[in-house]
């Protein structure tokens, strides 16, 4: 079974401590080889994927993952119960909602079962690793002859998210962007009725409930304005 897990790169906001146990030996043994870094992302606080680069191992190795929460009621060591695979080799672990405790220090340990002393431990702040789902149900309302208001919904606690709105007209190549706080609405005060506008939004778990660096995917775009224009004779649906 080949499972492809798409996760953003980078883990800037994690606090990571690495502990590598090696055998005292003059020659380089397999236990001195560093284990790959584990990257965890919590998707909308519904599930968490902790993945590693399995191809960095010198030979195909089914590394095992254990986890626990530091200094908490959940400090019992747990085995991964749902591995993710890449070309039949373990490359990650998926944890379900009930196993996620955002505000306790998450400790994850990767181990080579053939060399039990070859292990690495990282400590992660999960509230900084949340990636919300893309905003949904974008709607546009005309507040006045030249003013538009964009609204959207998120499948998460609204006060925990900040947003980024981008918009452009048909002949713009670049986007104009505007940050929006937890209120999830955006007003464009001056709209040219002769132009067609495209809007899209993404969200981030920041700053009230966490300090995540990674944004959600972009929403489906929504359009406003004339269906055809003299310069750009292409038809659009109201919502892509």
């Amino acid at each position: 079974l080949n499972t492809t897990i798409l996760t953003p790169n980078g883990n800037e906001d994690t606090t990571a401590d690495f502990f590598l146990t090696t055998m005292p030996t003059d020659s380089l043994s397999v236990s001195t080889l560093p284990l790959p870094e584990v990257q965890c992302f919590v998707f909308n606080v519904e599930y968490m994927n902790c993945t590693w680069n399995s191809s960095s191992e010198p030979q195909p190795t089914n590394l095992t993952l254990h986890y626990w929460y530091k200094n908490s009621d959940n400090d019992k060591v747990q085995k991964c119960s749902h591995y993710l695979f890449s070309e039949e080799i373990t490359s990650g672990c998926q944890l379900q909602k009930k196993e996620i405790h955002l505000y306790q220090t998450f400790v994850v340990q990767l181990q080579d079962p053939r060399e039990p002393r070859r292990q690495a431990t990282q400590m992660l702040k999960l509230q900084n690793l949340v990636i919300p789902w893309a905003p949904e149900n974008l709607t546009l309302h005309k507040l006045s002859e030249s003013q538009l208001e964009l609204n959207w919904n998120n499948r998460f606690l609204n006060h925990c998210l900040e947003h980024l709105v981008q918009y452009r007209t048909d002949w713009d190549h670049s986007w104009t962007e505007q940050s929006v706080d937890y209120r999830h609405k955006f007003s464009l005060p001056s709209v040219d009725g002769q132009k067609r506008y495209t809007f899209r939004v993404r969200s981030r778990f920041n700053p009230l409930c966490g300090s995540a660096q990674h944004w959600s995917e972009w929403s489906h775009p929504i359009h406003w304005g004339s269906n055809t224009s003299k310069e750009n004779p292409f038809l659009f649906a109201l919502e892509a």
Epitope: L6, W171, H173, S174, W175, W218, F234, A240
Partner: antibody
Framework: QVQLVESGGGVVQPGRSLRLSCAAS????????MHWVRQAPGKGLEWVAG????????YYADSVKDRFTISRDNSKNTLFLQMNSLRAEDTAMYYC?????????????WGPGTLVTVSS | DIQLTQSPSFLSASVGDRVTITCWAS??????LAWYQQKPGKAPTLLIY???TLQSGVPSRFSGSGSGTEFTLTISSLQPEDFASYYC?????????FGGGTKVEIK
């Protein structure tokens, strides 16, 4: 890693047609706008055409309008440039380029190019 | 259409020199400008976008500045691998346009 590979170039007579392809891999092709840029021998870069991520809008340089058509097949991760009524001045190296997902949308990845020579 | 004029077209310099290339836009484009480097026989690579934002992996000796109609690309200390052609591109509106290019040669 992102990879773009153009193909379909060659020698063609004036007035004839040619179809270029650009095979994309290493990224989610259906999420990104794509472009064709050309460079005549010993000359500078010239933007030719661009297409939005879903194909809903297409844009062209005046020099190729009504002769060239940009299209894409998101199921096959492939970008196309159909070139009709070719002229000697269309002789160039043709590059496909991917937009970066930032507000400014620069071209962050380019293919190695495919050479089109229009000559009788 | 927005025209971009690059100056100079050719530039001879030595390793270690500070090099400045200028790009003028025929109308205001705010900071919607990118710079690319191209080596002979190769595809261009992105150096700078948003007039001054360094693309990931690009050495810090490259910098960009400007807004509106005048923009500059500066190489603070020219290295052997920097001898190449450089192009500006406006990213504001269609049709997209490039400057005519600047070829940086060894003196």
């Amino acid at each position: 890693q992102v990879q773009l590979v153009e193909s379909g170039g060659g020698v063609v007579q004036p007035g004839r047609s040619l179809r270029l392809s650009c095979a994309a891999s290493g990224f989610n092709f259906r999420n990104f706008g794509m472009h064709w840029v050309r460079q005549a021998p010993g000359k500078g870069l010239e933007w030719v055409a661009g297409i939005l991520y879903d194909g809903s809008s297409k844009y062209y340089a005046d020099s190729v309008k009504d002769r060239f058509t940009i299209s894409r097949d998101n199921s096959k991760n492939t970008l196309f440039l159909q070139m009709n009524s070719l002229r000697a001045e269309d002789t160039a190296m043709y590059y496909c380029a991917k937009e970066e997902d930032t507000a400014m949308v620069p071209f962050d990845s380019w293919g190695p190019g495919t050479l089109v020579t229009v000559s009788s | 259409d927005i025209q971009l004029t690059q100056s100079p077209s050719f530039l001879s310099a030595s390793v270690g020199d500070r090099v400045t290339i200028t790009c003028w836009a025929s109308q205001g484009i705010s900071s919607y400008l990118a710079w690319y480097q191209q080596k002979p026989g190769k595809a261009p690579t992105l150096l700078i976008y948003a007039a001054s934002t360094l693309q990931s992996g690009v050495p810090s000796r490259f910098s960009g500045s400007g807004s509106g109609t005048e923009f500059t690309l500066t190489i603070s200390s020219l290295q052997p691998e920097d001898f190449a052609s450089y192009y500006c591109q406006q990213l504001k509106s269609y049709p997209l346009t490039f400057g005519g290019g600047t070829k940086v040669e060894i003196k």
